[in-house]
């Protein structure tokens, strides 16, 4: 049977009808509407937008739309006591101060409530001391400083350039190195693409532009005061000293005009190699401290931000399924922004809005999806994925029993070159099949499929003729669904050409210059890339909610498990002597992967042959597919990261944005040669191999014939 027959509706109401209803002009209109004022989490403006979206989703035809509120820890600058950094002379006089705000973009000079640049959740403090330049503040940058260059960051203020890794990891690394403060800045090497003008004349970062962002190390905890449980009316809250993931030293972000003033005076050691040099006309000396003439001058930070428990609001819309209402496909993206949110998040929220409108139009014509679709407008994503995590904590029992899939919908664009997809291997075939049916929006690919342009521009490094699909990491609202609950997840957006553009993210990320005009003038004037992303995200939701057999292919998991096992074994084999000494074997893991591969193959054969008209057998097979992702969850979680429970994937311990495979084994092996107790360290490697092998074998058995 087709999915149309399954829900007794006319063939007119199929995927094509849904996709044809999506309109670029509507996405443009919605983006404009969502970006005229700031929508910072915890503010009245963002509450009003939540109510507006609730009202519009109801008008679009959803069965119900509710607000779900939580009282979570947020962070704001002190309005009367601004944050800044100064250079002070030997008498303590401030001879240079960084700017207190970004110059507003044209047309926005009179907008109120633009939050000045700050690092959310920085503690208060006024540390002063010598500066050390630490490159990107990655793990390997501190190894270079401490081990090779013998530079001690203890008691120093470090200055790090944004990029490469999540800013929270930078701060954690600086803390561990003993720093007493962190200055984050955007270097033109990373945030100014050659040959492009600064905003408002182009999409590059001007010297006064600054990236805001949180600096937490939550490791999936959600609200720092209520880890594991929803921050509801009767919540028990930890004291601030026991809060999860808060930084212990002051942190503040600046633009490259201000960074120039700090870096141009740097003395001490020269940069170790060219990879430590940015594009400013400064020596990129590491320090510590300023050069000769300025050696008596110090840097002083003035940070007065406050952490406050504040109410946030998610909007949750429901479109009830006709056949399996107790199976949930979720489309979610955040609504809160740092300032106007021209790209992050409103380019995503506008797409979600148009997807809801299209589904609502079909529903008004008598159609329903087979499974229930939940739509979410999350709050406080920028403050640590708080809205999505609290909602998932509140609804975890329903989600772990009923959650089929989660599709994320943050920024629709970070460039206009090609598609970028990160997802569970279960969704590879869904994404491939869908993109083969969609038209490419790319110049030079008229009349060609999206799959074709995507594969040409972003080829898979392993399989010729296929596009690159990346691992899920974190830094967005899918985290709780995938890493904690084990719900199959995916995300898609349009991206830049990573070959030619070496800058991190997009230049105006989290700055005041991320406006509607940025998108309309420079990134997507016709909104054709937004429309394509709407088709991909919406198409995935449609198929997941409407196909009779879930569009998951477990054989693709088998392929990647073998690849990941090969990779982690090769990493371990960098230590052959120790492996022999401590009798380390990956045989159990390779054996489990082999079993998984064989069982997945047999399951796929049964999936082709079974009687789809038998609703019990259909439900049984679909449940095996739905619960496969869940089978990779270890209830005990990863070491010291209890909310990262997926054994195959976790955010990298060195970069929250990146995904790591077999993270338990990877972390046990990381820098193992420096461990003081090798026997204990290799024992942990062996334990992690055991956990991984057991989990893969257990997951395989969920695909075996049930009796």
């Amino acid at each position: 049977k087709s999915s149309n027959e399954a829900t007794n509706i006319t063939p007119k109401h199929n995927m094509k009808a849904f996709l044809d209803e999506l309109k670029a002009e509507n996405i443009k209109k919605f983006l404009y509407n969502f970006t005229q004022i700031p929508h910072l989490a915890g503010t009245e403006q963002n509450f009003q937008l939540a109510k507006q979206i609730q009202s519009q989703w109801k008008e679009f035809g959803l069965d119900s739309v509710e607000l779900a509120h939580y009282d979570v820890l947020l962070s704001y600058p002190n309005k009367t006591h601004p944050n800044y950094i100064s250079i002070i002379n030997e008498d303590g006089n401030e001879i240079f101060n960084t700017s207190l705000f970004e110059p507003p973009p044209p047309g926005y000079e009179n907008v109120s409530d633009i939050v000045p640049p700050f690092s959310a959740f920085s503690p208060q403090g006024m540390p002063e001391g010598d500066l050390v330049y630490v490159n990107y503040a990655r793990t390997e940058d501190f190894f270079k400083l401490e081990r090779d260059m013998k530079i001690n960051c203890s008691g120093k203020i470090v200055i790090a350039r944004y990029g490469k890794v999540f800013r929270g990891n930078k701060v954690k690394n600086a803390q561990l190195a003993g720093a007493k403060g962190v200055i984050l800045y955007s270097d033109p090497a990373d945030y100014f693409a050659p040959g492009v003008k600064s905003y408002p004349d182009g999409w590059n970062l001007p010297g006064g532009g600054v990236q805001r962002g949180n600096i937490l190390n939550l490791n999936g905890a959600g609200d720092p005061l209520t880890p594991g449980y929803p921050a509801n009316e009767y919540a028990y809250r930890r004291g601030i000293a026991e809060a999860v993931g808060l930084p212990s030293i002051p942190v503040h972000p600046i633009g490259y005009y201000d960074a120039q003033k700090l870096l141009e005076k740097m003395g001490g050691s020269a940069p170790p190699d060219s990879s430590w040099r940015g594009s400013l006309k400064v020596p990129y000396n590491v320090g510590p401290g300023f050069t000769g003439n300025f050696s008596t001058q110090k840097v002083k930070m003035h940070i007065h931000s406050t952490n406050e428990v504040t109410r946030i609001y998610n909007v949750i819309g429901t479109l009830r399924g006709a056949v399996e209402p107790d199976r949930y496909v979720i489309l979610g993206g955040h609504r809160d922004s740092w300032v106007f949110g021209g790209i992050d998040p409103q380019s995503g929220a506008a797409v979600v809005h148009e997807i809801v409108r299209s589904f609502g139009t079909l529903k008004k014509e008598g159609w329903r999806p087979r499974r229930t679709i939940l739509f979410a407008s999350w709050d406080a994503e920028e403050f640590g994925l708080l809205g999505s995590t609290e909602w998932a904590e509140e609804n975890s029992r329903l989600l772990q029993e009923r959650g089929v899939a989660y599709i994320n919908a943050d920024s629709s664009i970070e460039g206009n070159y090609t598609l970028r997809v990160d997802c569970t291997p279960l969704m590879y075939s869904l994404v491939h099949n869908l993109t083969k049916e969609l038209k490419s929006p790319d110049e030079g690919f008229e009349g060609k499929s999206l799959y074709e342009s995507w594969t040409k521009k972003s080829p898979s490094p392993e399989f010729s003729g296929m596009p690159r699909i990346s691992k899920l990491g974190s830094g967005n609202d899918f985290e709780v669904f995938f890493q904690r609950l084990g719900i199959a997840s995916g995300r898609a957006r349009y991206t830049k050409n990573w070959e030619t553009n070496k800058f991190s993210g997009y230049p105006l990320y989290h700055s005041v210059y991320e406006t509607y005009e940025l998108v309309e003038k420079f990134y997507d004037p016709m909104f054709k890339y937004h429309l394509t992303v709407a088709q991909v995200r919406g198409g995935m939701v449609f198929e997941l909610a409407n196909s009779i057999v879930l569009p998951f292919d477990c054989r693709d998991y088998a392929v990647v498990l073998r690849k990941y096992a090969d990779k982690i074994y090769s990493i371990s084999m960098k230590h052959p002597q120790e492996m022999k000494t401590y009798s380390v074997s990956f045989d159990s893991l390779f054996s489990a992967v082999k079993n998984f591969t064989e069982i997945a193959s047999k399951f796929s054969e049964r999936l082709q042959d079974f009687d789809k008209s038998n609703p019990i057998v259909l439900r049984m097979m679909n449940d095996q597919l739905m619960f496969l992702e869940r089978a990779f969850i270890d209830p005990l979680g990863l070491p010291d990261r209890p909310f990262y429970r997926h054994v195959i994937y976790a955010p990298s311990s060195h970069n929250k944005y990146a995904g790591e495979s077999f993270p338990g084994i990877y972390d046990a092996l990381f820098d193992i040669e420096s461990k003081v107790d090798p026997s204990k360290a290799w024992g942990e490697v062996k334990r992690q191999i055991y956990v991984a092998a057991f989990t893969v074998q257990a997951a395989a058995e969920t695909l075996s014939e049930v009796a």
Epitope: H575, Q577, V584
Partner: nanobody, 120 residues
């Protein structure tokens, strides 16, 4: 009794490719219970694993050297070979071919080793 014997030039110029072959007697490289690998030892350093071949063609490589190493096998001759490209003086070492149990670093048999010097 299993025996492994390395062969190849003892002197290689910088930036060139080092090529070595291992001939196995008394056992088959097709055996799927074992991996067939290359390891090296530089003066004053520990053993460094370069990579291994198994199942008559699948390979594992040291991530640090991955872009420079190719290991291939010839089951008809019961040989497997190593190619290490873009060599520098740091690649000067005694190179051994060895058998190890699948998915371990348990090298139960290895060749006597061949010294390869990288020098112009």
């Amino acid at each position: 009794q299993l025996q492994l014997q390395e062969s190849g030039p003892g002197l290689v110029k910088p930036s060139e490719t080092l090529s070595l072959t291992c001939t196995v007697s008394g056992g088959s490289i097709s055996s799927n219970s074992y991996y067939w690998g290359w390891i090296r030892q530089s003066p004053g350093k520990g053993l460094e694993w370069l990579g291994s071949i198994y199942d008559s063609g699948s390979t594992h490589y040291n991530p640090s050297l991955k872009s420079r190493v190719i290991i291939s096998g010839d089951t008809s001759k019961n040989q497997f070979s190593l190619k290490l490209s873009s060599v520098t003086a740091a690649d000067t070492a005694v190179y051994y071919c060895a058998r190890h149990k699948a998915a371990t670093a348990d090298f139960d048999y290895r060749g006597q080793g061949t010294l390869v010097t990288v020098s112009s």
